[in-house]
Interface confidence: low
């Protein structure tokens, strides 16, 4: 499999058949597939060097792994997008051997002197062809040369099989399955051959191809494949319930932010709640996690403005649940990205020198920002798309807080909507879905570059649009939701999560 280890070294060779028998639309489809693969790999923060070859009668090398920009995913994608099916029109045979020899030439070393660390680089070849080779020798011989070059399968004690993977995608109207099977790697419990039909669900294909065991701790990663559960799609989501004897129970959401912490809303708890009465579950697991302590933001005080006639005051409505035992990350349990961390810098593929302010400009520009939250409806987690009003609609969004029960007497809305809040909801630019009571504490998320970054914690809403947890279809335009802006509580997060290896900026 493609071992996505951010600390490892990898070369990926993309080889695309542009011969007559493929056809223009299949060629374009294959290109799209490779673009998606580059994006998927890049989303892991892995920076492999790419080689890019198209071929028919002759190969054409578009990107060499030795080029400085070969590890720049955006640049490689640009080169790939600029390739035309017509480029091989005049010599349109299928010489797969020559194409693989072009790959071999990129792998080999000048004067056959291997450079320092050569044996630590993993090599992945992704060949897209119909297998209808009609020129040159059998490409399998080149596969053997490559195996020899990389010292694979020679030493019984250390066969190094995981340093080479050859994937073959059968593209085109007629695919010679035997030919393509011959070229693909054969490894137990792994799939290295994919068909055209598979390419309709690329996420399923990538799920078969990628070994992410070295990068399970990466924040904001998801799997969208068809067999995936709700928690493959939002693996950070935590369900919280507080059992209060004789008072029923309170349901909230939260987000896994590290192996020991779940971030949620402070108002989900009261000072009387004992740790044993708080149930937290993650990854869709039945068992509840043991809680060590709930850490409230020190400035949170729901009764802070009672004397001023404000019954409930949600400023700094954030809390961290510290777990007794370390979470075991997997595909259904992994953290969401937090602002102003090194993980988010990498997730957004920004330079390592990126500042917290630059992350803020990237994630929360002064405009309507497309975001999402996760809600549970009929026992299923669903993503709800909303817009954070952070530009010219911000003021009117915040002013609608006056329609919230108990806030009608508030003279100055900034008394309740402090700078700590982000505002969503309403009907412009689109009719936003609203949060329900049980969504409190869940993350408000920005989805960028295939990664999910939490920018807010769901706190309170103007209108209860969810009778019996069913969202009403018709809601008033003033139905707004308010979320604690994580950029505004960073010192506290930084302090409490300082041992969690998040690399706060």
């Amino acid at each position: 499999k493609i071992v996505l280890d951010p600390s490892g070294s990898m070369n990926i060779y993309l080889v695309l058949d542009g011969s007559d028998s493929i056809g223009a639309s299949n060629f374009t489809g294959a290109k799209k597939c490779l673009v998606n693969l580059i994006e998927k790999v890049a989303s892991y923060g892995v920076k492999p060097r790419y080689g890019l070859v198209t071929y028919a009668t002759y190969p054409k090398i578009w990107v060499k792994v030795s080029e400085a920009d070969s590890s720049n995913a955006d640049w490689v994608t640009k080169q790939l997008n600029e390739i035309n099916y017509e480029d091989h029109k005049l010599k349109s045979g299928t010489n797969t051997k020559k194409a693989l020899q072009a790959v071999y030439s990129m792998m080999s070393w000048p004067d056959d002197v291997p450079p320092e660390g050569w044996n630590r680089t993993r090599h992945v070849i992704i060949l897209m062809t119909d297998g209808l080779h009609n020129m040159g020798g059998d490409p399998i011989t080149v596969i053997d040369e490559i195996r020899d070059l990389l010292y694979i399968g020679k030493d019984r004690k250390n066969p190094r099989e995981d340093y080479l993977d050859v994937y073959v995608f059968g593209v085109g109207p007629l695919v010679n399955q035997v030919n393509i099977n011959a070229l693909a790697s054969k490894k137990d419990n792994e799939q290295h051959v994919f068909k055209v039909k598979d390419m309709e669900n690329l996420e399923d294909v990538f799920y078969q191809m990628i070994d992410e065991s070295q990068s399970l701790s990466l924040c904001g990663m998801v799997w969208e494949h068809r067999k995936g559960t709700d928690y493959h799609k939002q693996p950070w989501q935590a369900k919280i319930s507080v059992i209060r004897p004789s008072k029923g129970h309170e349901s909230c959401m939260g987000a896994v932010v590290s192996e020991y912490f779940v971030l949620t809303a402070a108002h989900c708890f009261t000072v009387d709640d004992k740790e044993h009465s708080i149930k937290v579950s993650v990854g869709g697991e039945k068992r509840d996690l043991e809680i060590e302590v709930v850490l409230f933001h020190p400035n949170y005080n729901i009764n802070g403005k009672k004397e001023a006639g404000i019954p409930e005051f949600y400023d700094y409505d954030v809390a961290l649940i510290k777990l007794k035992n370390k979470l075991k990350y997997g595909q259904t349990i992994r953290p969401i990205c937090l602002p102003c961390t090194e993980g988010t810098t990498r997730a957004l593929r920004l330079p390592p020198t990126t500042t917290c302010q630059q992350q803020k400009e990237e994630l929360l520009p002064a405009q309507d920002i497309k975001a999402l939250f996760v809600s549970e409806e009929e026992k299923k987690l669903t993503r709800k798309e909303v817009y954070i009003k952070n530009g010219d609609k911000k003021g009117s969004c915040e002013r609608d807080a006056q329609y919230a029960p108990g806030y009608d007497k508030v003279k100055d809305i900034s008394e309740v909507v402090t700078p700590r809040f982000l505002c969503t909801g309403g009907v412009s630019p689109y009719a936003d879905p609203n949060t329900c009571r049980g969504d409190s504490g869940g993350p408000l998320i920005v989805h960028k570059r295939s990664r999910f970054i939490q920018v807010g914690v769901i706190s309170w809403g103007v209108v209860d649009v969810c009778k019996n947890q069913k969202r009403q279809k018709q809601v008033p335009a003033h139905a707004r939701d308010f979320h604690i802006n994580l950029f505004q509580v960073l010192p506290w997060l930084k302090e409490k999560l300082q041992d969690e290896d998040l690399g706060f900026l």
């Epitope: 020190p298 400035n299 960073l490 010192p491 506290w492 302090e495 300082q498 041992d499 290896d501």
Partner: antibody, heavy 115, light 107 residues
Framework: EVQLVESGGALVKPGGSLKLSCAAS????????MSWVRQTPEKRLEWVAT????????YYPDSVKGRFTISRDNAKNTLYLQMSSLRSEDTALYYC????????WGQGTSVTVSS | DIVMTQSHKFMSTSVGDRVSITCKAS??????VAWYQQKPGQSPKLLIY???TRHTGVPDRFTGSGSGTDFTLTITNVQSEDLAVYFC?????????FGAGTKLELK
Amino acid sequence: EVQLVESGGALVKPGGSLKLSCAASGFTFSNYAMSWVRQTPEKRLEWVATISNRGSYTYYPDSVKGRFTISRDNAKNTLYLQMSSLRSEDTALYYCARERPMDYWGQGTSVTVSS
Amino acid sequence: DIVMTQSHKFMSTSVGDRVSITCKASQDVGTAVAWYQQKPGQSPKLLIYWASTRHTGVPDRFTGSGSGTDFTLTITNVQSEDLAVYFCHQHSSNPLTFGAGTKLELK
């Protein structure tokens, strides 16, 4: 009740070394970041070092970086400060303190660097 | 480094008075400021953290306020046991820094 008791302070010559200890009790030591702060003869407070609760991270100001090493033994509930290449400006009362910001301080141990 | 400036080295007060001790940070530290009280021969004691939160057991005559760069510790109804040196401290970023202290004395 939270208690922090420093020890190991002494009179030492410039260029010399010294190891301070701080015995903690009354709280779960391994749950907290710990720091050393010193108070100069002029009564100024200076942060010296911080170590995270599991000891993975250590932080120092430039004035002591490379000369001082903070460490901890969570099994013994003890915090340490190894000081080397001592200078006269290191003369101070050294406190160990819990958390960040420091919520509990010990009584201090006196270090005098003089020839 | 962030410099914490306490402009008054000394402040005179009388029992029952209200006094405000100020502290200015050289750059924005949000609300990551703490106030300590130190009496002669004793170690510093935490009074206020996160600019305005009273530490456990601290009498409510002590209040903290401010954010960004300007911070104030206010003592209403000063008691004789409040005569001490007060230090402000920023824990927003390393290196952690303290103010030089303000000594509260009787007029």
